[in-house]
């Protein structure tokens, strides 16, 4: 068998072909996929097989990060002559079929969608009755997750020397922009640290030195939107404390 | 911690049975296909048996076909195999395996027991 | 039943050095290849799935390549640790077979 990738450009489909000249199985699925944080998006998935008339038990399987050995989200199985996909695992209970595998359709929606949810599906199909086949796709889709700024904590810090100096970490993507402003700060990037591993759409920025008491605010801003929070910082003058 | 652990080995007499076991850990048992491989003493691996997630299919070589039995409990996260009319040339290190993927089919094992021995003489 | 046949039985090679193991299917077995590692009286591990999928945690020094009924295992520079006996196994149907296995040697 031969497994290729074509790009079909007027569908934008990545099509898997695994073939020979008796049978044929190809899969269809986009690149990518974009939807906004809250919302729903479907993922479609269709496929052709070499097994016509198959009517025996089926399962279909959605899984996340890589293709054949990443953790599934979803998995519903069909008994033997059954239209009914009954559904054994969604993870947090978000994933849903929206297609008819028995039409050879495993298109799925994702509910409530959230930035973790950004990252590469992959489906597959099995049958188990008297023919005994499956296929998964190698590529996959990619869910691309949007959202607006959030800024998930904002914070002054003890630093050496009685000194004191203010974290901003905001979430969204495309990743905001930090900018701080406050006492004698104007506008200020301020050491924007970028996305970390792992955690790629938390951008953290840090003021590492506040001489001035007063209101510090941290704006996040994408093209989505922005947000914003502040942070007070009050010393008592003589003594080695602070309030915030 | 990710682990599969089997029980049961033993020296049986030909003709005799035994009752292996495994237990597994750290994964959702009920999720994925499960599986006894065997390795007779200086031998290769030889596939035994195979079960889907769910306990709906289960699959034998020839050489056991009739005399083994694969099951699981997904409630208590434990694999079996009933081994009846035991023969000499069932001598071996069994080995409980997950597949890697899918609750119906074994595309690799990703992870294995650490071995049981059965020695089956007179 | 599909046969698994391993070249060679055995190897002896140094550290640093590449080494490749084949593994041939009697028929079209598609991607559904996998290879294993194991050492006297441990377990097998899996390094390979699908043919060219490295499993979690296993270096990239190991490759594999192939379909339909031609399948290789690539080391591209031992390492102590890579002396073992090497065995292929198709899951394109059941039963499931296994090659002989090839034992690498410290030359």
């Known amino acids: 068998f031969v497994r290729t990738k074509i790009d079909t450009t007027e569908n934008l489909l990545n099509t898997e072909v695994h073939s020979s000249p008796a049978q044929r199985w190809s899969m269809q699925v986009p690149p990518e996929v974009s939807a906004e944080a809250g919302d729903a998006a479907v993922l479609p998935c269709t496929f052709t097989h070499p097994h016509r008339h198959y009517d025996g038990p089926l399962t279909a399987i959605w899984r996340a990060g890589e293709p054949y050995a990443g953790p599934q989200v979803f998995r519903c199985a069909a008994a033997r002559g059954s239209e009914l996909c009954q559904t054994a695992l969604s993870l947090h209970g978000r994933f849903r079929l929206l297609g008819n595998p028995r039409r050879n359709d495993l298109s799925l929606r994702v509910e409530r969608l959230a930035l973790a949810d950004d990252r590469r599906y992959f489906c597959r199909v099995e049958f188990a009755g008297d023919v005994h086949d499956r296929y998964e796709s190698r590529h996959g889709v990619r869910l691309h997750v949007t959202a607006a700024p959030r800024i998930v904590n904002i914070s002054v810090l003890p630093s050496p020397a009685h000194a004191f100096r203010a974290l901003c970490t905001a979430e969204g993507e495309p990743p905001p922009a930090l900018a701080w402003s406050g006492p004698a700060l104007g506008n200020s990037l301020a050491a924007v640290r970028s996305p970390r591993e792992g955690h790629g759409h938390l951008v953290t920025a840090e003021l590492p030195a506040l001489t001035h008491d007063g209101r510090y605010t941290c704006t996040a801003a994408n093209s989505l939107g922005r947000s914003e929070a502040s942070v007070y910082l009050f010393r008592f003058h003589g003594a080695s404390g602070a309030s915030t | 911690e990710v682990q599969l652990l089997e029980s049961g080995g033993g020296l049986v007499q030909p003709g005799g049975s035994l009752r292996l076991s495994c237990a597994a850990s750290g994964f959702t048992f009920s999720s994925y296909a499960m599986s006894w491989v065997r390795q007779a003493p200086g031998k290769g691996l030889e596939w035994v048996s195979t079960i889907t997630g769910g306990g709906e299919s289960t699959y034998y070589a020839d050489s056991v076909k009739g005399r083994f039995t694969i099951s699981r409990d997904n409630s208590k996260n434990t694999l079996y195999l009933q081994m009846n009319s035991l023969r000499a040339e069932d001598t071996a290190v069994y080995y409980c395996?997950?597949?890697?993927?899918?609750?119906?089919?074994?595309?690799?094992?990703?992870?294995w027991g650490q071995g049981t021995m059965v020695t089956v003489s007179s | 039943d599909i046969q698994m046949t391993q070249s060679p039985s055995s190897v002896s090679a140094s550290v640093g050095d590449r080494v490749t193991i084949t593994c041939r299917a009697s028929q079209d077995i598609s991607s559904w290849l996998a290879w294993y590692q194991q050492k006297p009286g441990k377990a097998p591990k899996l390094l390979i799935y699908v043919a060219s999928y490295i499993h979690s945690g296993v270096p990239s020094r190991f490759s594999g390549s192939g379909s339909g009924t031609d399948f290789t295992l690539t080391i591209s520079s031992l390492q102590p640790e890579d002396f073992a006996t090497y065995y292929c196994?198709?899951?394109?149907?059941?039963?499931?077979?296994f090659g002989q296995g090839t034992k690498l040697e410290i030359k």
């Open positions: 196994q198709q899951s394109y149907s059941i039963p499931y077979t």
């Open positions: 395996a997950k597949a890697i993927g899918s609750s119906w089919y074994s595309d690799a094992f990703d992870l």
